[in-house]
Each structure stands twice: as C-alpha cells, then as structure tokens.
C-alpha cells in the first residue's frame, strides 16, 4: 500500500480580522494509525494549535467529525482571527507509540494572512493659526491594518499635493501596523472654507478608501484690511466718521476709536456680514462733535483681531473756519486733512 | 536578498555584559529561527542559542545562565547579551539565520552576518 | 549533546581531482518523518561560513553541483566531484535535528 501523504492544499490564505479560518488538511490512508497534530511555526520553537487527542483548544474546531472510523479530514476552523494568529501552519500525523507517539509525516504548510482594516484617518493641523502665505504642516494617522501595504494621498479642495512624508511603522515585521503623513500646505486669503484630506487605501478596503478632514477655517487667520472713511451729516457741528474692516477671519474682532491718542470707545464686533469666501465684514462709525475742539482732530481706528498685536489707520479732522467741503481718507499712511463742518 | 549586520562593542572588559545586536534587512523575521554562534581564535564553531519568531528561545546548556537573545521585530532586530564574561568568550560572534520548513528539525543555516570580533581584555 | 566528529582534520587536495569529507553523529540525524538533519558548510579564510547542504543531500540556493551530500542515520559524505582553487576553506558538518545544534571540529582543504 502506498505510505501515508499528508496534504495541505492551500499553499496560503488570507481571512479578515474576526473572521473564521479554515485551514485544509486531509491524509491519504487510515495507516498508521496515530493522531493528527496542528502545529503554527515549525522546529523545536513550534506552537501547537491543536492536538486531536487531548488538550482544551476553544477556538478551534474539526470540519469533520473526527470520530467516524474512516475519517481522512483533519482540516479545521480557527474562530476570531487577530492579526496575531497570522504565521504558517502544518498539519502533522503522528505514529502510535510508547510512551510517546512519534512523529510521522507533516503537510508542507498554510501560511495564514490576516487582513485588518486601518482605523479612520485622523487628521490634525497646527496649534496656532497662522495667516495666508505662509506654510503649515498637517499630519494624518492611521493604525491597526494588515498586511502592510498602504497608500496615503493628501488634498486640498480635491487637488492632490504632493508636498508631504509619510512612514509605516515599525519597519520590521508586526502583526498590525500604522501610518503616519505630514504634508505641507500653503495658505491663501481664500482658504477660509478650503479642505485638507488624508485618503488611505488598503486590501481591506475593497477599492473605498478611508478619508480624514481638516477645515482650514481652524488654522487660517485672514487679518482685516481697515478703512477709515467721514461721512457729512445734517447737524453742521457734527462729522460721522467710519471705520470699514473688511475680509477678516475669524470674527473674534475688538475695535477701539482714539481721538487725539485718547480711548473714545471700544465695541466688540457683533453684526458682521460674512462674503463668499467665508471672510467677515464689520463696520463702526464715530461721531465727532467738531464744536468742542478747538484745534484738528486725529482719530484712530484701532483693531485687535483674534488675539494679535493691534492694527489702527487714523484719520485727521482739519477744524477750520467754515469749510464749504468735505474729503475722506481711503489711503493708509499718514491722516489725509479732511474739512470738517463747524 | 537577506543581509545581517552585527554591531556592538569590540572589546569588553572581563565581568562585564557583551551586547551585540544583529539588524535584519531585506526579509522578514517570521518563520525563522535567529541565531547566534561564535568561534574563538584558531577554533571551530560553537552554537550560543537562537531565538524562533514568535519570541521562544533556546540555549547553549552551559551557556544558558549567562545568555539572553531578544527579538525586536519592530526593528527587524535580534540582540545577545552574555554576562560576566571571561577571556574564554573572546571570539569572532556571528548572527545567522535558521530555515524550519515543516517538522521538529531544521533546515540549515542559510544566512550569516560578516561577523563581529569581541576582545574580552582588561 | 548530539557530538559531530568529522575526518579527516585536513585534506590536501589537487584542482580538478575528487575530494571527500566524511563526518558521523553520535546518534541517528534520520528523524521518523524520514527526513535527515545533516547540513554541510564551508568557510572560505576571512569569511563567514555558507551552507552548501541542508537535508543530508539538498544543495543550498547557487552552490556548484561539484558538491554533493549523502548518507543517512549516523554516517554522512560531501563529495567534490573536482575541486577548484576557490574550494580552500574549512568544511564544518553540523547537526540540525535538536538543540543544541552541533558542529564538527571542520576539515581544512588546502591545495597541495
């Protein structure tokens, strides 16, 4: 008769994490007679999965049933997979002995892959806000997916940078792993409601990759361009003077009015009128009465936006005698003299 | 293709600790046994111990107070250390690698590093 | 301990001519699945040693097929069909089949 063959038909398969794994074994002959043994790993390091004579195995469990007398199936099933029970199995037969059965023959091996699924990107910007032109690293993470084999792609408003550094880590092996991306993104003044994404791409992902955002509205600061215009009014000995901050983001905005270098008023902003890009526009006006001064008047607008050092553009108020004209300051720099109504 | 690299001290003093790491590159830890054996001045190779993938070691028998092999897979790194040591353990140290197919048994030494000489000198 | 002892400790050989190296085991390499745990090497000088031989008689990935192993149980052989000058080296036989694993005590062949 033909000696014994123990055949494993799958040279290697891979089940998804929480999954059931079954691993083929089956023998071509009832003789010898001795039990079969499942080993992961060969060599004297060897781990035993599952021993047909004794032993408590609680994950594992036979495809047949072993007990019929011509039973030549030995294959079983391995319950919950981890990424941990990922390693090479051999179904070995072993020759009735004493005291001990020896061992006779084993299959040539399944090696056993898991696959997990990486964890939802994480995406995380920079601790402070900085303003347009200048460049701010994001960085997105991802763990726990095998095998290793990922691809991470960065976006800005469904444009792929290519300005970034990703590592998988550990570089050896493991039984799961993580991935880690910095990219590198330049600010506009228009990037109020502008996107970062970090996509991953895995085998377990059936071609849906994973995406993690991040609002650039959390890391962007658009500081306010001011204008500091006068208005006439009807009452002859009084100017209106305004003060436009425009296209300024976020809207923690804090305005103060100086005349001559002394605080007049300070108002937070409240009303704001937001535009398209998601920047905001607030506007304060003053009334001067021109009466009770005797000589010119500069008045200041003086605005502290979201925390920074204060932004201010002034404006002169020429008292002179009857004027018949009134100017306005729309130019930064030194306080343009304007008429003022007396 | 596989390569191993060992590193550590070349000379250690008498009754101090011998630390040599060995870095695996090109392949992967799993299903291997890795190994260190050395071979003092003039002689012949003598086994230390060896460490399989799944952390369980083996060792020398009159060695085995003195050795310990860990395994980094992380790093794809395996490390000896050997205490108290004496002029006797001075010798060319070599990492190796430990096939095992199927069985009890093993399958050959297939892959050694270039070496590293330890001097145990005062 | 499973011992090695090989034979002879040096070998002077002549390029193009056989050599042979014998080597036995104090117990049996043949294990009961039928496999043997014999393997042969060699150490060219200033080099680590390379395995030629795993199994009694399998050659190792790009080893010549001037080399060649037998035996089985506690006797073994490694033939060189004809030696070649690169061959010089010392030949170490070692035991795989239980720890510890074992060497010979190696066969220095030298060109004469």
């Known amino acids: 008769e033909e000696e014994l063959q123990v055949i494993q038909p799958d040279k290697s398969i891979s089940v998804a994490a929480g999954e059931s794994a079954t691993l083929h074994c089956t023998v071509t002959s009832l003789i010898p007679v001795g039990p079969i043994q499942w080993f992961r790993g060969a060599g004297p390091g060897r781990e035993l999965i599952y021993n047909q004579k004794e032993g408590h195995f609680p994950r594992v469990t036979t495809v047949s049933d072993l007990t019929k007398r011509n039973n030549m199936d030995f294959s079983i099933r391995i319950s919950n997979i981890t990424p941990a029970d990922a390693g090479t199995y051999y179904c070995v037969k072993f020759r009735k002995g004493s005291p001990d059965h020896v061992e006779f023959k084993s299959g040539a091996g399944t090696e056993l892959s898991v696959r997990a699924k990486p964890s939802a990107p994480v995406v995380s910007g920079p601790a402070a806000r900085a303003t347009p032109q200048h460049t701010v690293s994001f960085t997105c993470e991802s763990h726990g997916f095998s095998p290793r084999d990922i691809t991470l792609k960065w976006f800005k408003n469904g444009n792929e940078l290519s300005d970034f550094q990703t590592n998988v880590d550990p570089a050896g092996d493991s039984v799961s792993y993580s991935i880690h991306s910095t990219a590198k993104v330049v600010l506009t003044r228009e990037d109020v409601h502008s996107q970062v994404i970090c996509e991953v791409a895995h085998v377990t992902l059936q071609g849906d990759p994973l995406r993690g955002t991040a609002n650039l509205s959390e890391t962007i600061r658009v500081p306010p361009t001011l204008e500091v215009t006068q208005q006439p009014v009807r009452a002859e000995n009084q100017v209106n003077v305004t003060c436009q901050v425009r296209k300024f983001y976020p809207q923690r905005l804090q305005l103060t009015w100086l005349e001559n270098g002394n605080v007049s008023r300070t108002e937070t902003a409240s009303t704001l009128t937001e535009n398209k890009d998601g920047t905001y526009n607030w506007m304060s006006w003053l009334l001067v009465n021109v009466s009770a001064h005797r000589d010119d008047v500069k008045l200041t607008c003086q605005v502290e936006h979201d925390g920074q050092p204060a932004v201010s553009k002034s404006h002169d108020l020429k008292v002179s005698a009857h004027p018949k004209e009134q100017g306005s300051n729309t130019a930064p720099g030194p306080a343009l003299a304007s008429a003022a109504p007396l | 293709q596989v390569q191993l690299q060992e590193s550590g001290p070349g000379l250690v003093k008498p009754s101090e600790t011998l630390s040599l790491t060995c870095t695996v590159s090109g392949g992967s830890i799993r299903d291997y046994y890795w190994s260190w054996i050395r071979q003092p001045p003039g002689k012949g190779l003598e086994w230390i111990g060896f460490?399989?993938?799944?952390?369980?070691?083996f060792y020398q028998s009159s060695l085995k107070s003195r050795v310990t092999i860990s395994l980094d897979t992380s790093k794809n790194q395996f490390s000896l250390k050997m205490t108290s040591v004496t002029a006797a353990d001075t010798a060319v140290y070599y990492c190796?690698?430990?096939?095992?197919?199927?069985?009890?048994?093993?399958?050959?030494?297939?892959?050694w590093g270039q070496g590293t000489t330890v001097t145990v000198s005062s | 301990d499973i011992v090695m002892t090989q034979s002879p400790l040096s070998l002077p050989v002549t390029p193009g001519e056989p050599a042979s190296i014998s080597c036995r085991s104090s117990?049996?390499?043949?294990?009961?699945?039928?496999?043997?745990?014999l393997d042969w090497y060699l150490q060219r000088p200033g080099q680590s040693p390379q395995l030629l031989i795993y199994g009694g008689s399998s050659r190792a990935s790009g080893v010549p097929d001037r080399f060649s192993g037998s035996g089985s149980g506690t006797d073994f052989t490694l033939k060189i069909s004809r030696v070649e000058a690169e061959d010089v080296g010392v030949f170490y036989c070692?035991?795989?089949?239980?720890?510890?694993?074992?060497f010979g005590q190696g066969t220095k062949v030298e060109i004469k």
């Open positions: 190796a690698r430990v096939r095992a197919y199927s069985g009890i048994g093993l399958d050959g030494t297939d892959v």
């Open positions: 460490i399989y993938y799944n952390g369980r070691t």
């Open positions: 070692g035991q795989a089949l239980q720890t510890p694993l074992t």
């Open positions: 117990q049996s390499l043949l294990y009961s699945t039928g496999y043997t745990y």
